[in-house]
């Protein structure tokens, strides 16, 4: 019996087609992805093959103005329109709190939304009961397939799930649910989830009874043969893991941003064992036409976005200096504003030991593309912010050793004076440079704001200590020559859309007046 699994993950609000790098589509003839194009391909496959499942491995939420405005209603509407069969909860599905998940998505989705390792407690337990499930048995033709979901247990540090959801260890939570499916005589089981490729592989290895793992979170690109675009494969598609009980378990992921549609064909024997698996992600490029009906619906929903981008978010009573003459040479108040917003966006529940889990931000000055003049009545709009942060990036959470941070700050000024983009703006960090010294030895003082303290204060950076830092995904990926970050980071979790982080902060503050205050000397 053959099953075709179509899968997406980490779509992050890319409802419209995008450029090849998943930013805003500029030249339509070269654009990719988007739900209208995805629908065309999905329907093509549904028409050609008998047993097809369309699955999403989480993080539909967050990433463009679509999410900012529609807050998840767009996800439910268009996933319903594409007739998804199931979705796993990702960490970003909690970005607007549990209510921001329940109302727009859980109550509106016609497909099951899954996670076996999220347990509700307290008053939330009854409110959310049945709205998401640990697993679902799906009929496919004359057979049944069990889908069991999982979500990153780091979600409380990455999003806003509140205090009434417990995120358990994935493997511990999955095993009993898979066992339950087996007792229901379900012998074909897919683990669908959002914990990253390393955990996907562990699940394939450790959870008895899981036949296939469809993952997300790490934006992993797998491919067999010559890749069709810029993404470099992390391994073959599917990636085969030998389980502890000796089975070959295919593991797949489909990069991110709706650029590819994962396509996996699985052949099962009559006892539900995987006999063979093959496939590849399908690049959704302009050779695949956008479905006119879905496209028309997108255009209808688009109208509200255009109105939103000119509305006032808040006011500034000072000039927001985002000029390259400032931000690539010295501390600039636009850099301070953005870093403060980045930290504010990552405030999580404190405990008796930590006032917050992260206190530091770094931001390449070259990523700040425009100032904002306060003389326009102080008004700040989304449009203004899109000029400052035009690249559609995210502000991510990484864990780095102090020694890596020191290298990053040395890199920040290794060729100072040439107006290059690697000059770092900061938050929760005090850095002192001596530019008379030779490159690689210019950082003379580097103090960082404590997190394990009730009153935050600055302490000298410790080389062997592991620190959490918020930074643009561009830096996490080694951009602007920050190869040491990419090579030495111990953990990387993608965060929220850059403009959204700053706009939310400005809306919250209402009036802003960031200063240059001696963070960089």
């Amino acid at each position: 019996w053959e099953l075709t699994i179509l899968h997406t993950n980490d779509v992050h609000s890319r409802l419209e087609q995008t450029s090849e790098d998943s930013s805003k589509c500029v030249n339509a003839s070269r654009c990719m992805g988007g739900v209208a194009r995805l629908f065309t391909k999905v329907q093509q496959i549904r028409r050609a093959e008998p047993n097809v499942l369309l699955l999403d491995a989480g993080d539909q939420y967050q990433g463009t103005i679509w999410f900012t405005v529609y807050k998840g209603a767009e996800v439910a509407h268009f996933m319903n329109a594409l007739r998804y069969d199931a979705m796993a909860l990702g960490n970003h599905e909690f970005d607007n709190g549990v209510e921001g998940l329940i109302e727009p998505l859980l109550k509106e989705a016609k497909f099951p939304i899954l996670s076996a390792n999220i347990k509700a407690k307290g008053p939330l337990a009854s409110q959310i009961s049945g709205l998401y499930l640990p697993y679902k048995v799906l009929p496919v033709g004359d057979e049944v397939v069990g889908i069991v979901g999982y979500t990153s247990k780091e979600t409380p540090f990455l999003s806003n799930p509140g205090t009434n959801l417990v995120f358990e260890d994935e493997i511990t939570a999955l095993q009993p649910e898979v066992d339950k499916l087996k007792t229901l005589n379900v012998n074909k089981i897919i683990a669908l989830g959002h914990s990253g490729f390393e955990m996907d592989k562990l699940i394939a290895q450790k959870v008895r009874g899981v036949d296939v793992v469809v993952g997300g979170h790490s934006n992993t690109f797998l491919y067999t043969g010559n890749p069709p675009s810029k993404e470099v494969p992390a391994g073959k598609y599917p990636f085969i893991v030998t389980s502890d009980d000796g089975r070959k378990v295919p593991v797949v992921q489909a990069y991110a941003f709706g650029k590819y549609l994962g396509y996996l064909k699985i052949e099962f024997d009559e006892r539900g064992n995987v006999i063979s698996s093959h496939g590849n992600p399908i690049l959704l490029n302009s050779s695949i036409p956008e479905d006119p009906s879905i496209k028309a619906d997108i255009n209808k929903w688009r109208i509200k976005l255009d109105n939103y981008s000119t509305q006032e978010l808040g006011k500034t009573i000072v000039y927001l200096d985002g000029s390259s003459q400032s931000c690539r040479f010295r501390e600039c108040n636009m850099g301070n504003l953005i870093c403060d917003a980045m930290i504010n966006n990552n405030l999580r529940h404190a405990d008796e030991t930590f006032w917050n889990h992260v206190s530091m931000c770094i931001l390449n000055g070259g990523g700040i593309r425009s100032p904002i003049d306060e003389r326009n009545n102080g008004t700040i709009t989304w449009e203004n912010l899109a000029a400052v942060l035009p690249f559609g990036g995210t502000f991510d959470l990484v864990q780095l050793k102090g020694s890596t941070l020191k290298k990053a700050f040395e890199h920040s000024v290794h060729r100072y004076g040439q107006s290059t983009g690697e000059f770092l703006q900061v938050g929760g960090i005090h850095v002192v440079y001596d530019l008379s010294r030779k490159p690689g030895d210019r950082v003379v003082k580097l103090d960082v704001l404590c997190t394990k303290c009730r009153v935050p204060s600055y302490d000298p950076l410790k080389m062997d200590e592991v620190y959490k830092v918020i930074l643009p995904n561009f830096l996490a990926n080694g951009g602007d020559g920050f190869q040491m970050i990419k090579d030495e980071l111990l953990r990387h979790d993608s965060g929220d859309q850059d403009i959204n982080v700053v706009s939310t902060y400005i809306s919250k503050m209402k009036v802003i007046y960031p200063a240059v205050e001696g963070r960089i000397k």
Partner: antibody
Framework: QVQLVESGGGVVQPGRSLRLSCAAS????????MHWVRQAPGKGLEWVAV????????YYPDSVKGRFTISRDNSKNTLYLQMNSLRAEDTAVYYC??????????????WGQGTMVTVSS | DIQMTQSPSSLSASVGDRVTITCRAS??????LAWYQQKPEKAPKSLIY???SLQSGVPSRFSGSGSGTDFTLTISSLQPEDFATYYC?????????FGGGTKVEIK
Amino acid sequence: QVQLVESGGGVVQPGRSLRLSCAASGFTFSNYGMHWVRQAPGKGLEWVAVIWYDESNKYYPDSVKGRFTISRDNSKNTLYLQMNSLRAEDTAVYYCARGGSSWYPDSFDIWGQGTMVTVSS
Amino acid sequence: DIQMTQSPSSLSASVGDRVTITCRASQGISSWLAWYQQKPEKAPKSLIYAASSLQSGVPSRFSGSGSGTDFTLTISSLQPEDFATYYCQQYNSYPLTFGGGTKVEIK
């Protein structure tokens, strides 16, 4: 082979009740949404009811809502339509039809031969 | 409710003719449209689903096209056994609705 066979039709007085059955064979009945569709003499097709594969949802058009009830017994591979408060305009051939195996609306790939229901005093 | 309007309501054609039947939805239904053939005193038979997919066993002279609100069923070369009534049906949303039918008669 895949087959649907309706039964239970007949002549009934207005205001009375009737229960139609549809016996399925040749496929995994419990995996499919099942529908009733009717056709009044000399008229077109009208959808009457759906029940999801797992019985979790049922939908009806306004014309029969509150009077007709669709149900199924997956252990017996049988679909039912309980028709109460019958009216003259319910006179039709009633077809049982197989839908898809998901929770989305679907088309009908397999039809029964139909059973005639006449509501007349 | 979504109204389905079929045209023409009847047509006369000869064997070998190319026949086109149209179906219009009162609102967008994407590609969630099916076509059925019904012969007198018989149950309907599925021809096409998802606007353009041929049901297995249906001759390739039948084809469907369209998306959104306007759809077409085409019989490329009418055969004697094709004289029947044809119905479209939307399955975008409940209640499911059918067109009024198009009767294809022998000229």
